[in-house]
């Protein structure tokens, strides 16, 4: 009977081990070891035993001890199990962006490592174990699928191997891959909301607002706003899960016509777009022409209004007959027309919308000067010592200057409160004078003395 000790050995790869071979008889005819491993007999041995040192053990092996005793030949094997940690533990790259709500497949590759029976592969989120599997195959590949939520954004995923050699060598060997950070995103299926004018006038400023709710992470979202070939430069305001991009747009005559307004919100590797048609139009204000802006009373004045060829005009609220871009009327200027406004309103249909433009011109009518009985009475009779305010209003454009003088020497205080005295009595010559000429009117002041009452 041949014996071997130790019957089982676990050792690190490239390690050495001492193995004792012994025979059951006292004087074996032969005693030895058969192994492909480099071996060295450790002397001195005994009559019925030998000690060998096996070195550079690279893989599992079963060296065999044999003995030849008088009663027969026998052999015994020792089981050498080599252990080593994996040479490569690698988590497959994660997608640059992972949509929220979509399952994520984690894949880990393990190269090397033995004994495989004692090698476990774990997939981790941070330090939390998601899956634990045995390492099978070379390289071993372990996968697991996990649902992804918003709280996974920025989470670290890794792969860890455990070589558990307990209770043999009372050791647990761990190898961990480089962590991979997950970027999750949530872009709703609804397109952005785009608020913009449907029609925009050349050389005017319009405001475009593009907004979208339900974005995650909102700070990573990008917005693209463009009107035709013109890229807009929006100011972006971020909410909790929403964003609003506001841009000013000014269009030129070259862009006249129908243009596409595009708003795109990009998040992760996805884009949501909204398109809208904007009609760009040119519509100058109508022209109001007066044959002369300043005329003398009695002059005939032609008031003419002309607008865009496709517009319809109204002059002082009266539509052109027939409806069209021109309207005119004739008037004989009266003092009442002085300062009168002539307003032309033009209406143009653009993309089903009515747009309006107004222009106003004022007529100046030169008239007077005038001194009428109504505004400058020819006779006043006042009690002596009473308080009176002489009133005399001259009319005209330009506004006339007025003076009332008695005998060219005594002025009558027009519009001022006076105490009536005998000196005030008499006939005053009131003169109204402007660049258009001069009119005069006599005004008589009678003073009633108390003794005549």
């Amino acid at each position: 009977q041949t014996s071997v000790f130790p019957p089982e050995v676990i050792l690190p790869r490239g390690g050495s081990v001492k193995v004792n071979c012994s025979a059951s008889c006292d004087q074996p005819i032969s005693l030895g070891m058969e192994t492909p491993l480099p071996k060295k007999e450790i002397l001195p041995g005994g009559n019925n035993w030998k000690m060998y040192e096996l070195s550079n053990v690279q893989e599992d092996s079963q060296p065999m001890c044999y003995s030849n005793c008088p009663d027969g030949q026998s052999s015994a094997k020792t089981l050498l199990t080599v252990y080593w940690t994996p040479e490569r533990v690698e988590l497959a790259p994660l997608p640059p962006w992972q949509p929220v709500g979509k399952n994520l497949t984690l894949r880990c590759q393990v190269e090397g490592g033995a004994p495989r029976a004692n090698l476990t592969v774990m997939l981790l989120r941070g330090e939390k174990e998601l899956s634990r599997q045995s390492a099978v195959g070379e390289p071993a590949e372990v996968t697991t699928t996990v649902p992804v939520g918003r709280d996974d954004h920025g989470a670290n995923f890794s792969c860890r191997t455990e070589l558990d050699l307990r209770p043999y060598v009372l050791k647990l060997f761990e190898n961990t891959s480089a962590p991979h950070q997950l970027q999750t995103f949530d872009l709703p299926a609804t397109p952005p909301q785009l608020v913009s004018p449907q029609v925009l006038e050349v050389d005017t400023q319009g405001t475009v607002v593009c907004s979208l709710d339900g974005l995650f992470p909102v700070s990573e979202a990008q917005v693209s706003l463009a009107l035709g070939d013109q890229k807009l430069n929006p100011t972006i305001t971020y909410g909790n899960n929403s964003l609003s991009a506001k841009a000013s747009v000014k269009v030129t005559a070259e862009e006249e016509g129908t243009q596409q307004l595009l708003c795109g919100v990009m998040l992760g590797n996805q884009t949501q777009e909204t398109r809208q048609t904007v009609t760009i139009y040119s519509f100058p204000a109508p022209n109001v022409n007066l044959t002369k802006p300043e005329v003398s009373e009695g002059t005939e004045v032609i008031v003419e209004c002309e607008a865009h060829p496709r517009a319809k005009v109204m002059l002082n609220g009266v539509p052109a007959q027939p409806p069209g871009p021109r309207a005119q009327f004739l008037l004989k200027a009266t003092p009442e027309d002085n300062g009168r406004s002539f307003s032309c309103s033009a209406t143009l249909e653009v993309a089903g919308q009515l747009v309006h433009k107004n222009q106003t011109r004022e007529l100046r009518v030169l008239y007077g000067p005038r001194l009428d009985e109504k505004d400058c009475p020819g006779n006043w009779t006042w009690p002596e010592n009473s308080q009176q305010t002489p009133m005399c209003q001259a009319w005209g454009n330009p506004l006339p200057q007025l003076k009332c003088l008695k005998d060219g020497t005594f002025p009558l205080p027009i519009g001022q409160s006076v105490t009536v005295t005998r000196d005030l009595e008499g006939t005053y010559l009131c003169q109204a004078r402007s660049t258009r000429g001069e009119v005069t009117r006599e005004v008589t002041v009678n003073v009633l003395s108390p003794r005549y009452e």
Partner: antibody, heavy 117, light 110 residues
Framework: QSVEESGGRLVTPGTPLTLTCTVS????????MGWVRQAPGKGLQYIGI?????STYYASWAKGRFTISKTSTTVDLRLTSPTTEDTATYFC??????????????WGPGTLVTVSS | AYDMTQTPASVEVAVGGTVTIKCQAS??????CSWYQQKPGQRPKFLIY???KLASGVPSRFKGSGSGTEFTLTISGMQSDDAATYYC????????????FGGGTEVVVK
């Protein structure tokens, strides 16, 4: 339109003197004419006025000492009995009471009267 | 009587400065107050009529105000050319008058 005074000269006290204001470019029937004097180194002193109707009005101190009269183109100021205190430059003024402004406030260059024995 | 009292009799003012001349009528002359500027050897120059209206060609630094019995002439941003004697005149009554003119204010520019 202009006004110009004449007749200023050296007179002995008590010798009556008439100053004449000749107007051109306007009618005296529609304008009042006044007389103002200024003694050497002194202020302006109002003497009197003749209205467009021909009525005359005098400063209280001037009554009896001066007489204002007019023809169609001239206005006269008569110093009835001059004294040395009447030595002054005498100005003729058109419309001193008109409130249309400086187009009517027309002053002559003045004429110097010297009363001395 | 409708007479005018003017103050001060003389005033000294620096170039760029402001001067205020006052006139008081013995009774209300409403707004009928005129102001004149006179330089030595020259006839009076008409400045202001109806208390506050500027005669044509008169710079806006001359300002008249007041009504009734109290009137003021203010000259701001004085220039050396403004050195003269200034007179107020009541232009309301041509009778019952002792003197229609104020006594005058000599303005000396430093």
């Amino acid at each position: 339109q202009s006004v110009e005074e004449s007749g200023g000269r050296l007179v002995t006290p008590g010798t009556p003197l008439t100053l004449t204001c000749t107007v051109s470019g306007f009618s005296l029937s529609s304008h009042a004419m006044g007389w103002v004097r200024q003694a050497p180194g002194k202020g302006l002193q109002y003497i009197g006025i003749i209205g467009s109707s021909g009525s005359t009005y005098y400063a209280s101190w001037a009554k009896g000492r001066f007489t204002i009269s007019k023809t169609s183109t001239t206005v006269d100021l008569r110093l009835t009995s001059p004294t040395t205190e009447d030595t002054a430059t005498y100005f003729c003024v058109r419309d001193p009471y008109d409130s249309f402004g400086d187009a009517y406030r027309l002053w002559g260059p003045g004429t110097l009267v010297t009363v001395s024995s | 009587a409708y007479d005018m009292t003017q103050t001060p009799a003389s005033v000294e003012v620096a170039v760029g400065g402001t001067v205020t001349i006052k006139c008081q009528a013995s009774q209300s002359i409403y707004s009928y107050c005129s102001w004149y500027q006179q330089k030595p050897g020259q006839r009076p120059k008409f400045l202001i009529y109806d208390a506050s209206k500027l005669a044509s060609g008169v710079p806006s630094r001359f300002k008249g105000s007041g009504s009734g019995t109290e009137f003021t002439l203010t000259i701001s941003g004085m220039q050396s050319d403004d050195a003269a004697t200034y007179y107020c005149q009541q232009a309301y009554s041509s009778s019952n008058v002792d003197n229609a003119f104020g006594g005058g204010t000599e303005v000396v520019v430093k």
